[in-house]
């Protein structure tokens, strides 16, 4: 792969071993101003696999508020507006990075954590082949 | 709101002003071992709004690899396996936190950045505007 030369203006770090502690500027560079998913689109209502958004709050985590999708139905909405159980609504999940205060209640010390969140729902055909 | 007392064992921080620099342990606490979304589920193939996953790599970002969903069709797949253009496949997007090396090429100095990623696709009824 390509070796990128280290910038000579980098801050010093004492310990190069893992667990590695780095400096992180929390002044977020944010290209996306709209953080409430309910406002950003109404797909959650118009989807054939509609979902509700639940607010998950944790003061020991950054970001402290995460929205979790929960599919409204087991089946999917058909052309007549009824739930069709031949198909299934399933949550689309994604692993995201969050900062967890460590030690707890510390304002300036965090640990990276990966969590799995449900972002929305999609309509799928049932599993027809079982993978052993 | 509830005020959580500060832990006396917290590391010192020089500057309490924003932009705030904090210490982050990069030894990730990961509850989810499966990071390749293609292995975690085959929803991208079984969905009525199927999608392809594209690998987005950036060595100046942490995580350096992010998977982006791109809907395969403008319409949705109907019961006959054909694309139905009365409905639309749309990407479900989510804002995620990443760490951006700042200054560039520095191994131990980052800035938090919010980016918008497409996680998967869902099938929606099109918006119908009635002209008065």
């Amino acid at each position: 792969g390509i070796t990128i030369p280290r910038n000579p203006g980098c801050p010093n770090s004492e310990d190069k071993n893992f667990p590695r502690t780095v400096m992180v500027n929390l002044n977020i560079h944010n290209r996306n101003t709209n953080t409430n998913p309910k406002r950003s689109s109404d797909y959650y209502n118009r989807s054939t696999s509609p979902w509700n958004l639940h607010r998950n709050e944790d003061p020991e985590r950054y970001p402290s508020v995460i929205w979790e999708a929960k599919c409204r139905h087991l089946g999917c909405i058909n052309a007549d507006g009824n739930v069709d159980y031949h198909m299934n609504s399933v949550p689309i999940q994604q692993e995201i990075l969050v900062l967890r205060r460590e030690p707890p209640h510390c304002p300036n010390s965090f640990r990276l954590e990966k969590i799995l969140v449900s972002v929305g729902c999609t309509c799928v055909t049932p599993i027809v082949h079982h993978v052993a | 709101g509830i005020t959580i007392p500060r832990n006396p064992g917290c590391p010192n921080s020089e500057d309490k002003n924003f932009p705030r620099t904090v210490m982050v342990n990069l030894n990730i606490h990961n509850r989810n071992t499966n990071t390749n979304p293609k292995r975690s589920s085959d929803y991208y193939n079984r969905s009525t709004s199927p999608w392809n996953l594209h690998r987005n790599e950036d060595p100046e970002r942490y995580p350096s690899v992010i998977w982006e969903a791109k809907c395969r069709h403008l319409g949705c797949i109907n019961a006959d396996g054909n694309v139905d253009y009365h409905m639309n496949s749309v990407p479900i997007q989510q804002e995620i936190l990443v760490l951006r090396r700042e200054p560039p090429h520095c191994p131990n100095s980052f800035r938090l950045e919010k980016i918008l990623v497409s996680v998967g696709c869902t099938c929606v009824t099109p918006i119908v505007h009635h002209v008065a």
Epitope: L74, Y85, H86, M87, N88, S89, V90, V124, T125, P126, I127, H130 | S41, Y43, R46
Partner: nanobody
Framework: EVQLVESGGGLVQAGDSLRLSCVAS???????AAWFRQAPGKGRELILS????????YTADSVKGRFTGSRVNTKNTAYLQMNNLKPEDTAVYYC????????????WGQGTQVTVSS
């Protein structure tokens, strides 16, 4: 823990009928009761799925018009009625249950062998 037990398999002639039963013990069937089969050297495939209301939500093309399913929720039992059996129906037949078959099946039976001779 729910346990599924199949019965009713055996050796039959082509054109005969068989009725398989699946009893859920230690709990109730979930939203979907399903029948899978696995022929020698092949993967396990879904042949029929029954929703809690009793409606059939999936029938594999290979068994359409010959196989049908039912369930009696009060007896925690699902049935697979197989008519006009063919040699290619020879397989181990498994019962499964799912809360959401889009995500996966939660419980599986041990299977019952069905052999159709010509």
């Amino acid at each position: 823990e729910v346990q599924l037990v199949e019965s009713g398999g055996g050796l039959v002639q082509a054109g005969d009928s068989l009725r398989l039963s699946c009893v859920a013990s230690g709990g109730t069937f979930s939203n979907y009761a399903a029948w899978f089969r696995q022929a020698p050297g092949k993967g396990r495939e879904l042949i029929l799925s029954i929703f809690r209301s009793g409606s059939i939500t999936y029938t594999a093309d290979s068994v359409k018009g010959r196989f049908t399913g039912s369930r009696v929720n009060t007896k925690n039992t699902a049935y697979l009625q197989m008519n006009n059996l063919k040699p290619e129906d020879t397989a181990v037949y498994y019962c499964a249950s799912a809360y959401n078959p889009g995500i996966g099946y939660d419980y599986w039976g041990q299977g019952t062998q069905v052999t159709v001779s010509s």
